[in-house]
Amino acid sequence: APVPPGEDSKDVAAPHRQPLTSSERIDKQIRYILDGISALRKETCNKSNMCESSKEALAENNLNLPKMAEKDGCFQSGFNEETCLVKIITGLLEFEVYLEYLQNRFESSEEQARAVQMSTKVLIQFLQKKAKNLDAITTPDPTTNASLLTKLQAQNQWLQDMTTHLILRSFKEFLQSSLRALRQM
């Protein structure tokens, strides 16, 4: 399911809880996606030794995965709600092609990979409702995405395993940075 079902077992709701606010719904949606990533990472780590590789060893890759930096306005120093929100939405839109790549990369967690992809689409919709300056959000070019997808799928097995690991790790990190920033809004 693209949206978490009610209160998950990890959360304790007060009796007769009010309906979730927009912020709570976004927070919960991110946590739901993080659960999905965690499950996918388990399968990836069981299949290959990528997870033991250091960050430095994996840094030499040609993937242009979105990353949060101080200039994006999401860090405490220079925090800017609107700039940050634009960065989060833009980053998630950029991740979509990589999430599409993940769709055929899992055997036992195929449904989980689809859930992460669909849940991310829902998250983007939630965030777009929250954003005031939608004009500042640049949508990735479909043609560029299509050729990137073809290129990634043409890699050898080892590189595909590496790519899968890097996407999951970077996406997790991006979501966590986003989660922290959104809680300040």
Epitope: D11, V12, R31, K55, E70, F75, Q76, K172, S177, Q184
Partner: antibody, heavy 122, light 105 residues
Framework: QVTLKESGPTLVKPTQTLTLTCTFS??????????VGWIRQPPGKALEWLAL???????HYSPSLKSRLTITKDTSKNQVVLTMTNMDPVDTATYYC??????????????WGQGTLVTVSS | DVVMTQSPSSVSASVGDRVTITCRAS??????LAWYQQKPGKAPNLLIY???SLRSGVPSRFSGSRSGTDFTLTITSLQPEDFATYFC?????????FGPGTKLE
Amino acid sequence: QVTLKESGPTLVKPTQTLTLTCTFSGFSLSTSGVAVGWIRQPPGKALEWLALIFWDDDKHYSPSLKSRLTITKDTSKNQVVLTMTNMDPVDTATYYCARSYDDYLYYALDYWGQGTLVTVSS
Amino acid sequence: DVVMTQSPSSVSASVGDRVTITCRASQDIDNFLAWYQQKPGKAPNLLIYKVSSLRSGVPSRFSGSRSGTDFTLTITSLQPEDFATYFCQQTRRFPLTFGPGTKLE
């Protein structure tokens, strides 16, 4: 196993700058979801949160002390350093460093150092 | 800042008793609450996070609950090693803030 240890001067003079180092092992500050923070406790009083630094170098400070605090990390050395300027006798306290590690960023501090007592006196 | 208040500030109890400590947040903090135990001369020790999640290794006699902005730490059947000071901490908003503590004696 996770360990953290604070080091630094036990006695500082008023107006001086305090530099404390937290050296940790058993985890990496380059792992997403990890943060290391500083908390202090004046003798017989409550805990006071000072600062927190995250894996991605985002830094959060207590607003009342922000102008006096700087937190930095050295991932390769497994160290976090806190500097506090213009020390005053009211800053006399046990200073703790602690770790937070949670995928959902709930910031509960699951491992603490033993603490170091810093006395500010002339 | 989110102000955390704790009651009582101290409580006397005997081994085997059931003890309840309450913590109130000045604004909604959702489930972002942790409880710590501190013994004299020692660092605090995390007992409970996310309102009611028991940290691994913590005895099941400790439990946490929530009602709105009121949070409760309950110790059923008090043991000799439970005599200590207990602090709550909200982790929803920066700055992270602690309660003033409850001394269990």
